[in-house]
């Protein structure tokens, strides 16, 4: 492998390792981590793309774990708080074996090649240009870390346009009890928009490393229902909306609506009386055709907590429930920025909303 580009490689660095990425991450930068997984001692290793050396702000945490059959966790840490995990349940690494791990930085995501095959796509939750450090720790021996710069560095677009494709996989939530809202999680990469966390906890400390709209505060331990809030900037590819809450023990139905003016662009309607999750669009008070298919059993359970992650991509919304990708809903209203209102109602208690 030729070590091209402006930065010299780190050769046989000792682990744990932290090193500067000269000039920070750039669109098109390719970083190769070559090494061997240790056959003894420890069940995990991690490669982190972070801001500074403290480990409190990690834009991309890539964490293979030789546990429970083997899986890889991807995550982001902001101000010391981890976001929801994305898990890949195939393990491309083998204990005692060498590996070649290549990270390709692109405007919308990191693409990770392991031993010559695309392994995972991780969409930026924080602007990647903040990253100036790579760190490696855990049960691994490194041969080198190399850097290959692109020939030209395009300006990062205001909006990410590459669709999200990797199924979301958070860790499963413990069932049967209320969950604390997750810590601060992803700020969106688009610089002209803001992420707003609507919280019912006591006032938090500084939530963002850059100025942001302060979170909406509620004096009660639960959200008012129905809950309605603005989605600043509307939808666009890579925009995420996260909700968590608890289904009431006697629940019949609840709904999560993404609205555009008088239209409901996306109506997510779990129905316990029908054991179904109905999806639809309402235009001018007229409902379209329902979508009900699910890849597995009804994920919402009366009396139990849940999380819903809605991720907008160019062609569709991807919806994950309790960390597992559930379905895609292809846009019927395609003017995404006009879809700028979230409405939640029905037989649930909300504990956390982030738009």
């Amino acid at each position: 492998m030729a070590f091209s580009g402006s930065q010299a490689p780190y050769l046989s660095p000792a682990v744990p390792f932290s090193g500067t990425i000269q000039g920070g991450l750039q669109d098109g930068l390719q970083i190769t981590v070559n090494g061997t997984v240790l056959s003894s001692s420890g069940t995990r290793f991690a490669v982190n793309f972070q801001t500074g050396f403290s480990g409190n702000d990690i834009a991309f945490h890539f964490n293979p774990r030789f546990e429970d059959g083997g899986y890889v966790v991807c995550n982001t840490r902001q101000n010391g708080s981890w976001g929801p995990e994305e898990r890949k349940t195939h393990m491309p690494f083998q204990k005692g074996m060498p590996f070649d791990l290549c990270f390709l930085v692109q405007s919308s995501d990191f693409k990770v090649m392991v031993n010559g095959i695309l392994f995972v796509q991780y969409f930026h939750r924080v602007p990647f240009h903040r990253v100036d450090t790579i760190s490696v720790n855990g049960s691994v021996q490194l041969s080198y870390i190399s850097f290959q710069n692109p020939r030209t560095v395009p300006v990062q677009p205001a909006f990410s346009t590459v669709p999200f494709s990797q199924p979301v996989c958070f860790p499963p939530r413990p069932r049967g009890r209320r969950q604390k809202p997750p810590g601060v999680w992803p700020a969106n990469p688009a610089p002209i928009t803001q992420t707003v966390i609507h919280t019912v906890q006591s006032a938090p400390g500084q939530m963002f490393s850059t100025p942001a709209i302060p979170p909406m505060m509620y004096p009660h331990p639960a959200y008012p229902m129905p809950f309605i809030t603005t989605i600043l900037g509307g939808l666009y590819p890579s925009k995420s909306i996260l909700l968590s809450g608890t289904v009431l023990p006697s629940a019949q139905r609840f709904h999560i609506n993404l609205c555009s003016g008088n239209h409901i662009a996306f109506h997510l309607n779990p129905r316990f009386d029908e054991n179904a999750v109905v999806r639809n669009t309402q235009i001018d008070n007229s409902w379209g055709s329902e979508e009900r298919s699910l890849p597995r059993k009804m994920p919402f359970v009366r009396g139990q907590s849940f999380s819903v992650w809605i991720l907008c991509e160019a062609h569709c919304l991807k919806v994950a429930v309790d960390g597992q990708h559930l379905f895609e809903y292809y846009h019927r209203l395609r003017n995404l920025p006009t879809i700028n209102r979230l409405e939640v109602g029905g037989d649930i208690q909300l504990t956390h909303v982030q738009t």
């Epitope: 195939h90 060498p98 095959i117």
Partner: antibody, heavy 126, light 109 residues
């Protein structure tokens, strides 16, 4: 000019062995992954195995796991497919192909098999 | 394993026709999908990589697109040399990192 040339095919009895070679020129096998793909007579393409010589990583289709072994000799710029315990259903034309080279001009991975050999026929029959 | 369901299995078309072939992945494969053309007795040739990028030297009448887990190969105006079998292929790491579609034979009407 990039080129891949397979050799080693032929007629073999069930339970027998063959070793296929894939000689590369115009690029180094250690900079790409090398795949074997087969095609039974009148059928579609079936992926068999791959090796990433740079790290030594190998992977196999379930249908050949435990019977076939892929390897590479970077000094000879050649990849190999050792086929043991051959069965009638292994009868096919075997191709080697190069996969996933990085295009620095476009900052893109070429997620596809951009160069293929001409193929070598393996016939398993008694 | 990730399955690639290709349709149709065969089609008849005339020179100048617009031809569309579709592959549906059984789960997300990102954009790591390629399309190949194969003629009898010959090795496959790469047409499209990364779902929509035209490979060097391939005529511009070939194009690829993606919508979720659906991938499409389009030949805008079929030429005599385009009568062949076409395969899609995914390469997104799974228990089997590479899988091909069943193939689509494009024949002369």
């Amino acid at each position: 000019e990039v080129q891949l040339v397979e050799s080693g095919g032929g007629l073999v009895q069930p339970g027998g062995s063959l070793r296929l070679s894939c000689a590369a020129s115009g690029f180094t096998v250690s900079s790409s992954s090398i795949h074997w793909v087969r095609q039974a007579p009148g059928k579609g393409l079936e992926w068999v195995a791959y090796i990433y010589p740079y790290s030594g990583y190998t992977s196999y289709a379930d249908s050949v796991k435990g019977r076939f072994t892929i390897s590479a000799d970077t000094s000879k710029n050649t990849a190999y497919l050792q086929m043991n315990s051959l069965r009638a259903e292994d009868t096919a034309v075997y191709y080697c192909a190069r996969y996933s080279t990085y295009s620095s001009s476009s900052s893109k991975w070429v997620w596809g098999m951009d160069y293929w050999g001409q193929g070598t026929l393996v016939t398993v029959s008694s | 394993d990730i399955q690639m369901t290709q349709s149709p299995s065969s089609l008849s078309a005339s020179v100048g026709d617009r031809v569309t072939i579709t592959c549906r992945a059984s789960q997300s494969v990102s954009s790591a999908v390629a399309w190949y053309q194969q003629k009898p007795g010959k090795a496959p040739k790469l047409l499209i990589y990364s779902a929509s990028s035209l490979y060097s030297g391939v005529p511009s009448r070939f194009s690829g697109s993606r919508s979720g887990t659906d991938f499409t190969l389009t030949i805008s105006s079929l030429q005599p040399e385009d009568f062949a079998t076409y395969y899609c292929q995914q390469s997104y790491y799974d228990s089997n990192p590479i899988t091909f579609g069943q193939g689509t034979k494009v024949e002369i009407k």
